[in-house]
């Protein structure tokens, strides 16, 4: 799996999970979140060469097409596969509110 | 939706469905498929600017992060959303075999 266990241990130019820390205030302009101040969002990036973690039959076909037609612009792209939620704390008036934001953290990637 | 109805009618630099015809023999080296000789596979390509058809909360966060940090390499990518199967005919010995290959045709795209 193109997850932290693999990607953070290996120098990998191909599609892989990349570390990305997002500071809510500085990076998103979200000043309302009390806790956490930021989080490890991660992101997916890298080349999708022939059969590198292909997601669907179409992406396998596309990577084969790209191998045989290297000048073509049609190629799979490295995107998130497994995502996890993030729990945040913010205030509505004086009332603390705990909320789970879905699909905030990328755990693994795929070529799609 | 970033589908043929929208994308094939509009000149669109942003993430959209692009036409791609694949000839089995020429483009994939698959000489065994009797019918069809090829098919409209299509593919997804184009920029994923802030909130352009964002797929998940993470891709929305990433596009916002990218807007505020334009020098960053972390940005969503244009990939397939809806896929359809393709029916093929080939021969095994003298016996014609009809098979449905899943996820062969891209019908719409998303920024993920």
């Amino acid at each position: 799996a193109l997850d932290a266990a693999y990607c953070f241990r290996n120098v990998q130019d191909n599609c892989c999970l990349r570390p990305l820390y997002i500071d809510f205030k500085r990076d998103l302009g979200w000043k309302w979140i009390h806790e956490p101040k930021g989080y490890n969002a991660n992101f997916c990036a890298g080349a999708c060469p022939y059969l590198w973690s292909s997601d669907t039959q179409h992406s396998r076909v596309l990577s084969l097409y790209n191998t045989i037609n290297p000048e073509a612009s049609a190629s799979p792209c490295c995107v998130s596969q497994d995502l996890e939620p993030l729990t945040i704390l913010y205030y509505i008036g004086k009332t603390p509110k705990i909320e789970q934001l879905s699909n905030m953290i990328v755990k693994s990637c795929k070529c799609s | 939706a970033l589908d043929a109805a929208y994308c094939f009618r509009n000149v669109q630099d942003n993430c959209c469905l692009r036409p791609l015809y694949i000839d089995f023999k020429r483009d994939l080296g698959w000489k065994w498929i009797h019918e069809p000789k090829g098919y409209n596979a299509n593919f997804c390509a184009g920029a994923c600017p802030y909130l352009w058809s964002s797929d998940t909360q993470h891709s929305r966060v990433l596009s916002l992060y990218n807007t505020i940090n334009p020098e960053a390499s972390a940005s969503p990518c244009c990939v397939s959303q809806d896929l359809e199967p393709l029916t093929i005919l080939y021969y095994i010995g003298k016996t014609p075999k009809i098979e449905q290959l899943s996820n062969m045709i891209v019908k719409s795209c998303k920024c993920s």
């Epitope: - | 080296g29 065994w32 095994i92 010995g93």
Partner: antibody
């Protein structure tokens, strides 16, 4: 150059299952079919079945339909064959090979995996 | 199943001689597409088979022109015009016109 690498030998007990691999290199894995053949001394060659890594399509010899299961792992360019409910009749050399289509001739063969079923 | 009968079982020859191996099928091997899917292989002791002739009469790449295949319908012949030491081994015919695909029992070419 085209290579199909198979483990040399497997020793298994009657009634058990065995999964053997065939790692392909030197060509585009998803453009060729992988075929599996059984060879017993004095019994000649028997076609077990074919699989196409590009789509996962499979075709089996009726005789082996309940005995063999063919799969591929495209990320590692590996074809696998699992044989179940093994008996002494299954002791043989099993070879993988590649071909351009179901009706095409096999153009390259693996060295074969020798399976011995014995208690 | 199509039975492939090879004769002779053993063929003793002197180096430089012509050798002829016969293969007979229990059904016609002419496909509805017009092709005859009859192939010839050579297997040397301790080695995997090597393709010599495919689709009746086509020499595989790298196969010397002293090898030739002929025949039609149900009767097929492999000829070696001048036997060399490297030609010794077991020759198999094989058909892929009918399912299940079947092989001949083999002809052992050996030195007289």
């Amino acid at each position: 150059q085209v290579q199909l690498q198979q483990p040399g030998a497997e020793l298994v007990k009657p009634g058990a299952s065995v999964k053997m691999s065939c790692k392909a290199s030197g060509y585009i894995f998803t453009s060729y079919w992988i075929t599996w053949v059984k060879q017993r001394p004095g019994q000649g060659l028997e076609w077990i079945g074919d699989i196409f890594p590009g789509t996962g399509s499979t075709n089996y010899n009726e005789k082996f339909k309940t005995k063999a299961s063919l799969t591929v792992d495209t990320s590692s360019s590996t074809a696998n064959m699992q044989l179940s409910s093994l008996t002494s009749e299954d002791s043989a050399v099993y070879s993988c090979a590649r071909k351009l289509g179901p009706n095409y001739a096999v153009d390259y063969w693996g060295q074969g995996t020798s399976v011995t079923v014995s208690s | 199943d199509v039975v492939m009968t090879q004769t002779p079982l053993s063929l003793p020859v002197s180096l430089g001689d012509q050798a002829s191996i016969s293969c007979r099928s229990s059904q016609s091997l002419i496909h509805s597409h017009g092709n005859t899917y009859l192939h010839w292989y050579l297997q040397k002791p301790g080695q995997s088979p090597k393709l010599l002739i495919y689709k009746l009469s086509n020499r595989f790449s790298g196969v010397p022109d002293r090898f030739s295949g002929s025949g039609s319908g149900t009767d097929f012949t492999l000829k070696i015009s001048r036997v060399e030491a490297e030609d010794l081994g077991v020759y198999f015919c094989s058909q892929s016109t009918h399912v299940p695909f079947t092989f001949g029992s083999g002809t052992k070419l050996e030195i007289k």
